[in-house]
Structures are given as structure tokens and as C-alpha cells.
């Protein structure tokens, strides 16, 4: 079982300020695919058989100047803005979603436009029926323009 | 088929300002190797059999202060400098090179010397004869001093 | 053979200023595991059989303002602080530890609190008995609070 999913334009979904938002993905077009019973449905990659999987994702973020880049604040800096990616596992056997991987970075840019990727990848023991999703701190900062910049995948080792 | 290639000192090649430059690689010395008919030739990794490959690269960049770090510009920030890595596929069946993976980051540093890596990795369906290369936005910013800082590899899953 | 190790609180160990410090890891609890004779002992992952392994690690660093972020220094910037991760191989057959992977980044933040990950991953030919460890430039900057932020793993390809 294996899959490589690529970003698509996101439909804005209202969510609480500090709550992470789940991304939805392209699974059939361009370089995206699912194979050998790996299934993508409703923002989740669904694991078809138990085993050890390598899971990876890159999210490219872009935005305009973060507040802490304001020169007037340099003498009394504030907690910086940040960008966060979490790969989350939801299991039928366990009610609470589990954070498998987290990439988080403070963003304090003095330039007018900034952009940067967060990359994650590691191996996990997964059970048949486990569901994986990618959550981000701010969906509006995700670069959805190119399939090679923002993606999510997994394969059985 | 598998390969791990490491950086070597690059021969400066003139290229257009906004055109990405292809890196050439060490394929035999130190930790570099190619195996099971994976072949390296003229900046390209050549895929010997069709299948799903995990492809990865890290490029470490280093430079001196970018313009936007100039204190006089803080009040009127300009478009920042950036660093970009692209892993590109060239296929006989398709004339246009395809960008498989892109890592791009704005660079706006106020320190005199900066350095940072961009890491990429993902799984792709490749055909026999496909050729892979790594392109960068500015070859002169690539840290070629150590094989553990800048590298490129692939293996059949 | 495969392993995914996760961070735990580190015991401070005195070490020389420019010497890298080895991290110790969780190998049994939470999402951490070792499998198929891969063994973790005394900060080292011990390779049980020769072959090509994919090795990866993410270290999340966090700290307070680095010196070069001080506004008074902007006109005469100093060499910035930096964060470094090295995955090191120790082999019985070779007395000198070998740096397999290095991720290094200058840190020059004007915000009061900064945090960011360094991710590494690549394939290496290893011999039975080779030992792998992860070293960092400053153990006190490593975020040990969550197993999904700082981890180390390897699997036979």
C-alpha cells in the first residue's frame, strides 16, 4: 500500500482560532496516486493493512510580514507568529487523535513577503483502518499553487 | 536500484538570471554510491526500471547578508531574496521537464553570514529511462564543502 | 531491522563549548520501538545486519532571542548563533566517528522566543555492528517535550 497526495485549492472552513485545520488532497490527478488498496477519503488516508509505514509531508507556507517584524517592536519583542504542521492518526481503537509528527516554526520576518516549507517524515506502526490526516495552523497561509511544493504520502516498508 | 550522491565543487556554468542551475554530483567516493543498475551520468540519475521510488535531497545554502536585511529598508521592505531547490524529471516520452519536488524559502537575514538547509523527499512513479536532476536558484550559494551537508538520493520502494 | 526513537528529557552532561553532545532516546514507550534485532543501547542504535538503511531524524530547537537580534548590532552584525544536528556513525573497523548527515542553520531572531525543526534523512550502506547516534550543538535548546517533535529512526531498505 502506498500513496502520494498533492495539494489542491482549499475550501475555507470556519474553525476555532487555535484549532488546527485539516487539509484536503488531490489523489488521482497529476503526480498524485493511491495504490494497493491505500484509500483516500474525506481528508484521510486510510491504511488497508497493518505494518510499518514511512509517512511524509511537506507544506509550503507563504504570507506577508508577521507583526514581530515591525521595527517599532524590536525593543520589546512579542511572542512571534508561527506555522505548524501536524500529521495526525485517528484510530477506531482509540478515541483521541494521536499526533505522529509535528513541525513547528516561529515566523518573524521583516520582509514584505515570506515563504518557506516545513518537511516531516518518519516511520510508524499502523493498524488496518487507521486514518491519517495533515493539519495546519493556518490554512490561508498554505501554498496550494503547485503539486511539487505541498504534498503528503505514505508507503508500507 | 538505489543511489546516494554527494556534493562536489561545482564548475561555474553561465546561466540566465532566473534560470535554475543543475548540480553535478559525486557518485563513487566517500559515502556516495550507485547500485543495482542505477546509473549517474552528466548530472542525471538514470532510472533503470519502472516503479515507485523514494527520492530525496538536502541542499545546504550559505551566504552573506541579503539586501532586505539592511536596516534602512525595514520601513519599506522589498521582495526578499530566496533560495530554491527543485528535483526535476526528464522523460523521453514527454519533452517538458517535470518538477517533482520544490523547496523554496525567502531569505532575509540581518546577520553577516547565514546558512541553512532545504530538505526534500517523496515517492514518485518513474519509468525506465527517466532522468532525475537537482536544480538550484544560485549555484554559488551551495555549500559543497561536506558530503553530509548536501546530497541527493533515490531508491526503489 | 527498523527503529523509531523519540526524545526524552536529557541529563545535562558537561561537554566542551564547540563539541557536539549526543542525545539519548526513548526506545520502548509511546510511539518508539526497535524491531527485528535493531538494538538501542547507551545513546546508540546498533545495526544488526549489513545493508542499505534509510536513516532520519528531526530535532526541534527552541530558545530566546539570539544575540545578533539585538537592534544595536544590526549595523555591525556579528557571526550569528547557529543550531546543528549531526547523525554520526561509529564503526569498530574505523576509529574516527563519521558524519553521515549534517543539518546546520544560522539563528538570528529578533523575536523573544523562537523555535524551529531541522530534518535530515538519507540512505547509507551500513555494516553489522555499526552504531548510530544523533549529536546536537546545544542540548539545552532541544525541545524534549513531545515525541512527535524530536525523533530518530532507521530502517533496512
Amino acid at each position: 500500500p502506498k500513496a502520494h497526495l498533492t495539494i489542491m485549492r482549499q475550501t475555507p472552513v470556519p474553525h476555532l482560532k487555535n484549532e488546527l485545520a485539516a487539509l484536503h488532497w488531490e489523489n488521482n490527478l497529476g503526480m498524485a496516486f493511491t495504490k494497493n488498496r491505500m484509500n483516500y477519503t474525506n481528508k484521510f488516508l486510510v491504511i488497508p493493512e497493518s505494518g510499518d509505514y514511512f509517512i511524509y509531508s511537506q507544506i509550503t507556507f507563504r504570507g506577508t510580514t508577521s507583526e514581530c517584524g515591525d521595527i517599532s517592536r524590536v525593543r520589546r519583542p512579542k511572542k512571534p507568529d508561527s506555522i505548524t504542521v501536524v500529521i495526525t492518526k485517528v484510530a477506531d481503537s482509540y478515541p483521541e487523535p494521536a499526533h505522529l509528527l509535528t513541525g513547528t516554526k516561529s515566523v518573524c520576518e521583516i520582509s514584505s513577503n515570506w515563504f518557506q516549507p516545513i518537511y516531516l517524515g518518519a516511520m510508524f506502526s499502523l493498524e488496518e483502518g487507521d486514518r491519517l490526516m495533515v493539519n495546519v495552523s493556518d490554512i490561508s497561509l498554505v501554498d496550494y499553487t503547485k503539486e511539487d511544493k505541498t504534498f503528503f504520502g505514505a508507503f508500507l516498508i | 536500484p538505489k543511489a546516494h550522491l554527494t556534493i562536489m565543487r561545482q564548475t561555474p556554468v553561465p546561466h540566465l538570471k532566473n534560470e535554475l542551475a543543475a548540480l553535478h554530483w559525486e557518485n563513487n567516493l566517500g559515502m556516495a554510491f550507485t547500485k543495482n543498475r542505477m546509473n549517474y551520468t552528466n548530472k542525471f540519475l538514470v532510472i533503470p526500471e519502472s516503479g515507485d521510488y523514494f527520492i530525496y535531497s538536502q541542499i545546504t545554502f550559505r551566504g552573506t547578508t541579503s539586501e532586505c536585511g539592511d536596516i534602512s529598508r525595514v520601513r519599506r521592505p522589498k521582495k526578499p531574496d530566496s533560495i530554491t531547490v527543485v528535483i526535476t524529471k526528464v522523460a523521453d516520452s514527454y519533452p517538458e521537464p517535470a518538477h517533482l519536488l520544490t523547496g523554496t524559502k525567502s531569505v532575509c537575514e540581518i546577520s553577516s553570514n547565514w546558512f541553512q538547509p532545504i530538505y526534500l523527499g517523496a515517492m514518485f512513479s518513474l519509468e525506465e529511462g527517466d532522468r532525475l536532476m537537482v536544480n538550484v536558484s544560485d549555484i554559488s550559494l551551495v555549500d559543497y564543502t561536506k558530503e553530509d551537508k548536501t546530497f541527493f538520493g533515490a531508491f526503489l520502494i | 531491522p527498523k527503529a523509531h526513537l523519540t526524545i526524552m528529557r536529557q541529563t545535562p552532561v558537561p561537554h566542551l563549548k564547540n563539541e557536539l553532545a549526543a542525545l539519548h532516546w526513548e526506545n520502548n514507550l509511546g510511539m518508539a520501538f526497535t524491531k527485528n534485532r535493531m538494538n538501542y543501547t547507551n545513546k546508540f542504535l546498533v545495526i544488526p545486519e549489513s545493508g542499505d538503511y534509510f536513516i532520519y531524524s528531526q530535532i526541534t530547537f527552541r530558545g530566546t532571542t539570539s544575540e545578533c537580534g539585538d537592534i544595536s548590532r544590526v549595523r555591525r552584525p556579528k557571526k550569528p548563533d547557529s543550531i546543528t544536528v549531526v547523525i554520526t556513525k561509529v564503526a569498530d573497523s574505523y576509529p574516527e566517528p563519521a558524519h553521515l548527515l549534517t543539518g546546520t542553520k544560522s539563528v538570528c531572531e529578533i523575536s523573544s522566543n523562537w523555535f524551529q525543526p531541522i530534518y535530515l534523512g538519507a540512505m547509507f550502506s551500513l555494516e553489522e555492528g555499526d552504531r548510530l547516534m544523533v549529536n546536537v550543538s546545544d542540548i539545552s535548546l532541544v525541545d524534549y517535550t513531545k515525541e512527535d517533535k524530536t525523533f530518530f529512526g532507521a530502517f533496512l531498505i
Epitope: 485549492r9 475550501t11 488521482n28 497529476g30 496516486f33 495504490k35 | 514527454y94 519509468e127 | -
Partner: antibody, heavy 119, light 106 residues
Framework: QVQLVQSGAEVKKPGASVKVSCKAS????????MNWVRQAPGQNLEWIGL????????NYNQKFKGRATLTVDTSISTAYMELSRLRSDDTAVYYC????????????WGQGTLVTVSS | EIVLTQSPDFQSVTPKEKVTITCSAS?????MHWYQQKPDQSPKLLIK???KLASGVPSRFSGSGSGTDFTLTINSLEAEDAATYYC?????????FGGGTKVEIK
């Protein structure tokens, strides 16, 4: 240049099945997703489903699920659409059409295959 | 499924006149395309991703819109533009088409 060449017109009886082929050339067959769209006489266009030639992954319009089967033979760069349990209202021109990414739209269309269902 | 309603169904226009066709979606759409189809021909991609001209399409064609309301404009109609025009959404499966707008030359 890109070409999608479809099989010829078919006349079928109600309850029978039809299999339409679409041979692709001029591009990497496994790199583009193949769609099937139909158009009844004087009617508008109706999307049947798609197949990713590389993975074999499919996505069907629920209206056709269970009756339409999309397959590919990558060795000859050919896609197939089989429609079973035909009814008279399945009489239509059936098009194959390839797309790379959803923001690209369907740039390449076959010439169409007329399937007539009549007793 | 997302229902696309085109308006008008039919338009008879003199050459050089401006033509405006609207496509209204029953829920928000991220990816909208427009196709032109002439009698006994396959559809042809005209406008992709709301406003981008497809390869080889004359600049008199343009597209705009967002959310649920989209527009195809032909700035100065030519005789060869007599055809039926369809909108199609690629936001959620099934990827539906509008009912079509037939443009006839007076």
C-alpha cells in the same frame, strides 16, 4: 501532437454491455488521468468517471457506479469504458478526455463514439 | 452534487456584439472551466481555472468570477463563435457540467 482515438460506433440491445476504447498518443499515457464524458442527442455533457492510468485508481459518478467500469492497458496506451445493463436512455456519444491537474481543465478530447441502444 | 445553472439557455447575437454567459453553482466552487462545442465536434477547452485562456484561444474570450458565480465573456463576437458553451466545475465529484448556452449568429 496529442491524440485520443476512439473505437467506432456501436449498436446494442437493452440489457447488453458495450466496451469503448480510447488509444492515446503524443504524451505520457500514465502521467494524465483519463475521463469519460457522455452526451445524449441534443443534451448536455455528463461526467461518467475517471481513471488514473498509473495506479488504476478510479472515481465514478454515483449515477454510473456499478454499471460503468473504467480500465486501462498501459502497454498499449489505451483506456476502456464498459457500460453494462444498457437502457435506451444510454444512447449517447461517449468521449474519452484527458486531464493533468484539476486547474488545467480537460484539454484533450477523443472524437467521440456513438452508442445506440435499441431493441 | 454541485448543480451548475447556465444563463441564458440561448442567445442570438449580431457580429461584433458582446456576449455574457453566466454560470451559477449550487455551492462554492474552487475550479471552474469553460468549453466550446460546435455541432458534431468534441468539446474544446476555452477558459481554465476561472480566467486563464487555454492554448490557442483568441483574446476576445475571457472568464471571471469566484465562489458560486462565474461569467464567460466574448468581447466582440465573430461568426466562428457560433457554438454551445458549457461551464464545468472540478471542485467536487461528480465533476458536473452546466446545461449549456447556445450562441447563434443573427
Amino acid at each position: 501532437q496529442v491524440q485520443l482515438v476512439q473505437s467506432g460506433a456501436e449498436v446494442k440491445k437493452p440489457g447488453a454491455s458495450v466496451k469503448v476504447s480510447c488509444k492515446a498518443s503524443g504524451y505520457s499515457f500514465t502521467g494524465y488521468t483519463m475521463n469519460w464524458v457522455r452526451q445524449a442527442p441534443g443534451q448536455n455533457l455528463e461526467w461518467i468517471g475517471l481513471i488514473n492510468p498509473y495506479s488504476g485508481g478510479t472515481n465514478y459518478n454515483q449515477k454510473f457506479k456499478g454499471r460503468a467500469t473504467l480500465t486501462v492497458d498501459t502497454s498499449i496506451s489505451t483506456a476502456y469504458m464498459e457500460l453494462s445493463r444498457l437502457r435506451s436512455d444510454d444512447t449517447a456519444v461517449y468521449y474519452c478526455a484527458s486531464i493533468y491537474q484539476r486547474h488545467d481543465g480537460i484539454a484533450y478530447w477523443g472524437q467521440g463514439t456513438l452508442v445506440t441502444v435499441s431493441s | 452534487e454541485i448543480v451548475l445553472t447556465q444563463s441564458p439557455d440561448f442567445q442570438s447575437v449580431t457580429p461584433k456584439e458582446k456576449v455574457t454567459i453566466t454560470c451559477s453553482a449550487s455551492s462554492s466552487v474552487n475550479y471552474m472551466h469553460w468549453y466550446q462545442q460546435k455541432p458534431d465536434q468534441s468539446p474544446k477547452l476555452l477558459i481554465k481555472d476561472t480566467s486563464k485562456l487555454a492554448s490557442g484561444v483568441p483574446s476576445r474570450f475571457s472568464g471571471s468570477g469566484s465562489g458560486t458565480d462565474f461569467t464567460l465573456t466574448i468581447n466582440s463576437l465573430e461568426a466562428e463563435d457560433a457554438a454551445t458553451y458549457y461551464c464545468q466545475q472540478w471542485s467536487s465529484s461528480p465533476y458536473t457540467f452546466g446545461g449549456g448556452t447556445k450562441v447563434e449568429i443573427k
